[in-house]
């Protein structure tokens, strides 16, 4: 799996999970989230050559097409596979609210 | 939806469905498929700016992050959303076989 266990310990040009810490205020301009101040969002990036973690039959066909026709502009892309929620604390007036924001943290990647 | 109805009639730099015909023999080097000789595989490509068809909360956050931090290398990617199968005819020896290859045709795209 193209997850932290694999990607964070290997130097990897190909599609892999990359670390990304997002500070809500600094990076997104959000002041409405009280806690946490930021979180490890991570992201997916890297090349998708033939045989590298293809998601579907189409993405594998596309990577083969791209290998045989390197001048082609059609190629698969490295995107998130497994995501996890993030629990946040915010306020409506003076009332604290705890909310779970779905699909906020990328845990693994794929070529799609 | 970022499908043929929308994308093929609009000139679109942003994430959209793009036409791609794949000739099995010429483009993939495949002789094993007897029929069809090729098919409209299509592919997804284009930029994923903020508010453009984000798939998940994470991809929306990432596009906002990328808008506020344009020097960042982290951004969502345009990938397939809906896919359809392709029915093919091939031979095992002299015996004809009809098979449905799943997820071979891209019908729409998303920013993920």
């Amino acid at each position: 799996a193209l997850d932290a266990a694999y990607c964070f310990r290997n130097v990897q040009d190909n599609c892999c999970l990359r670390p990304l810490y997002i500070d809500f205020k600094r990076d997104l301009g959000w002041k409405w989230i009280h806690e946490p101040k930021g979180y490890n969002a991570n992201f997916c990036a890297g090349a998708c050559p033939y045989l590298w973690s293809s998601d579907t039959q189409h993405s594998r066909v596309l990577s083969l097409y791209n290998t045989i026709n390197p001048e082609a502009s059609a190629s698969p892309c490295c995107v998130s596979q497994d995501l996890e929620p993030l629990t946040i604390l915010y306020y409506i007036g003076k009332t604290p609210k705890i909310e779970q924001l779905s699909n906020m943290i990328v845990k693994s990647c794929k070529c799609s | 939806a970022l499908d043929a109805a929308y994308c093929f009639r609009n000139v679109q730099d942003n994430c959209c469905l793009r036409p791609l015909y794949i000739d099995f023999k010429r483009d993939l080097g495949w002789k094993w498929i007897h029929e069809p000789k090729g098919y409209n595989a299509n592919f997804c490509a284009g930029a994923c700016p903020y508010l453009w068809s984000s798939d998940t909360q994470h991809s929306r956050v990432l596009s906002l992050y990328n808008t506020i931090n344009p020097e960042a290398s982290a951004s969502p990617c345009c990938v397939s959303q809906d896919l359809e199968p392709l029915t093919i005819l091939y031979y095992i020896g002299k015996t004809p076989k009809i098979e449905q290859l799943s997820n071979m045709i891209v019908k729409s795209c998303k920013c993920s």
């Epitope: 045989l51 039959q57 | 993939l28 080097g29 495949w30």
Partner: nanobody, 118 residues
Framework: QLQLVESGGGLVQPGGSLRLSCAGS????????MAWSRQAPGKQRELVAL???????AYVDSVKGRFTISRDNTKKTMSLQMNDLKPEDTAVYYC????????????WGQGTQVTVSS
């Protein structure tokens, strides 16, 4: 169930040659896309070369002009002729077959070590 067995690896001096072979059994070999992939210690896995059932081939830039991939469907074999070997070619080389029906599946050999050193 496809079985792949590689042979031909070994120790060779820089500038030397080796020929890797891969024998397949248990599948319609004539329709699969065959490839050689390699992994050096501490480096990412890398596609070296591939060859389709229609004999279309492709190579990673670093081996173009030095390596030649070929296949013989009647004998169910594939080979990789490696000339002008360099120390950076040192890796475990894997034979890979991709069958496309009824669903896509990759079959990997156990690998053969190639060491280029003086």
């Amino acid at each position: 169930q496809l079985q792949l067995v590689e042979s031909g690896g070994g120790l060779v001096q820089p500038g030397g040659s080796l020929r890797l072979s891969c024998a397949g059994s248990g599948i319609a070999f004539s329709r699969v896309t065959m490839a050689w992939s390699r992994q050096a210690p501490g480096k990412q896995r890398e596609l070296v070369a591939l060859i389709t059932d229609g004999n279309r081939s492709a190579y990673v830039d670093s081996v173009k002009g030095r390596f030649t991939i070929s296949r013989d469907n009647t004998k169910k074999t594939m080979s990789l002729q490696m000339n002008d070997l360099k120390p950076e070619d040192t890796a475990v080389y894997y034979c890979v077959a991709t069958d496309w029906v009824p669903t896509r599946r990759d079959y990997w050999g156990q690998g053969t070590q190639v060491t280029v050193s003086s």
